[in-house]
């Protein structure tokens, strides 16, 4: 006889999952503020900085009192999925100065993209409808100079942190409603 | 660097109104929640209330509902708090602060409003 | 009366360990992040903890959050005269649909 059928698959805990991926969030979280205080301090922002390729923001206090989870989920990881496009073409494109924010930046392209797979394991788990793939999204264009790289860290890493803090917001307020 | 910069602030008589302003800079205003708060003399912190980043939405404290409203102007980078019916235990220094998520990351300095006849 | 509980005062000599509690419901506390605001004599508040433990810019690491079910402390290793000051606890409500505080706690450095 072959060896004893091995213990029944236990569905996991909905709560636990998303717990563990609070903490995930919560660690990029505090990667990114991490990194955009070393960008500040060695190349100070002079203003805001805003790049129209990235993801408009999606959440606020007032929509908090809707969310669903499917739609949370869904709607983070394609926002995660951009940024972490843009942290890439950044480490490609960004230029010279931006190689003195290495390894970091590389660090957090690595997080960010092991987040991803966090969601997306989640929402297997949670058997949420998985989105369609990704369309090809249009290149995006070098920066115009090395200080236009260094504009555009600026509002990466402060457009990823705004976006990671919501999201840990969100997440636990879900986790409450599960 | 962000600052937010309150003004406004003034003696008042009990049932009159006062509109206080913050103005932002430093940072993209459009993107954040804004809030106000506020410290009564010798007393500790109160939320008075939220307004979302696109001004859609805003939550009130029981103690302000239907006498104060927030509002924004993201042209001007400037956040708003219309006080009316004011009342002696409205008394306090009044300030703004972003959210990124569920907490006040930077405050501005503070405007004084006192309610008194 | 506030909805969020910290001792009034708390005090300790410079190079000790000061722990602040904070303790509210499952409303508050139980469901949300946990915030800390530092308030030095005359200034503005400022950000000292969010997300329970986690650290702003800037903040240096001998502040350190922690949470437990509906309670939650700040601790301070290493104190100095420089942070002699009021410390506020915070937190969304679910049930009131605002943020609470706790009424604060002085700190003083002997």
């Known amino acids: 006889p072959g060896p004893p059928p091995g213990p029944p698959r236990v569905s996991p805990d909905p709560r636990a999952e998303l717990d563990s991926t609070v903490l995930l969030t919560r660690s990029l979280l505090a990667d990114t503020r991490q990194l955009a205080a070393q960008l500040r301090d060695k190349f100070p922002a002079d203003g805001d900085h805003n790049l129209d390729s990235l993801p408009t923001l999606a959440m606020s206090a007032g929509a908090l009192g809707a969310l669903q989870l499917p739609g949370v989920l869904t709607r983070l990881r394609a926002d995660l999925l951009s940024y972490l496009r843009h942290v890439q073409w950044l480490r490609r494109a960004g230029g010279s100065s931006l190689k003195t924010l290495e390894p970091e930046l590389g660090t957090l392209q690595a997080r960010l993209d092991r987040l991803l797979r966090r969601l997306q394991l989640l929402m297997s788990r949670l058997a949420l409808p998985q989105p369609p793939p990704d369309p090809p999204a249009p290149p995006l264009a070098p920066p115009s100079s090395a200080w236009g790289g260094i504009r555009a860290a600026h509002a990466i890493l402060g457009g990823l942190h705004l976006t990671l803090d919501w999201a840990v917001r969100g997440l636990l307020l879900l986790k409450t409603r599960l | 660097e962000v600052q937010l910069l309150e003004s406004g602030g003034g003696l008042v008589q009990p049932g009159g109104s006062l509109r206080l302003s913050c103005a932002a800079s430093?940072?993209?205003?459009?993107?954040?929640?804004m809030n106000w708060l506020r410290q009564a003399p010798g007393k500790g912190l109160e939320w008075v209330g939220v307004?979302?980043?696109?001004?859609?939405?805003?939550f009130y404290a029981d103690f302000v509902k239907g006498r104060f409203t927030i509002s924004r102007d993201n042209s001007k980078n400037t956040l708003y708090l219309q006080m009316n019916s004011l009342r002696a235990e409205d008394t306090a220094v009044y300030y703004c602060?972003?959210?990124?998520?569920?907490?006040?990351?930077?405050w501005g300095q503070g405007t004084l409003v006192t309610v008194s006849s | 009366q506030s909805v969020l509980t910290q001792p009034p005062s708390a005090s300790g000599t410079p190079g000790q360990r000061v722990t602040i509690s904070c303790s509210g419901s499952?409303?508050?506390?139980?469901?949300?992040?946990v915030n800390w605001y530092q308030q030095l004599p005359g200034t503005a508040p400022k950000l000292l903890i969010y997300?329970?433990?986690l650290l702003p810019s800037g903040v240096p690491d001998r502040f350190s959050g922690s949470k437990s079910g509906t309670s939650a402390s700040l601790a301070i290793s290493g104190l100095r005269s420089e942070d002699e000051a009021d410390y506020y606890c915070?937190?969304?409500?679910?049930?009131?649909?605002?943020?609470?505080f706790g009424g604060g706690t002085k700190l003083t450095v002997l």
């Open positions: 602060a972003r959210t990124p998520g569920s907490h006040f990351d930077y």
């Open positions: 430093g940072f993209t205003f459009s993107h954040y929640d």
């Open positions: 307004i979302s980043y696109d001004g859609s939405n805003k």
């Open positions: 499952s409303s508050n506390i139980g469901n949300n992040a």
């Open positions: 997300y329970d433990d």
């Open positions: 915070a937190a969304w409500d679910d049930s009131l649909n605002g943020v609470v």
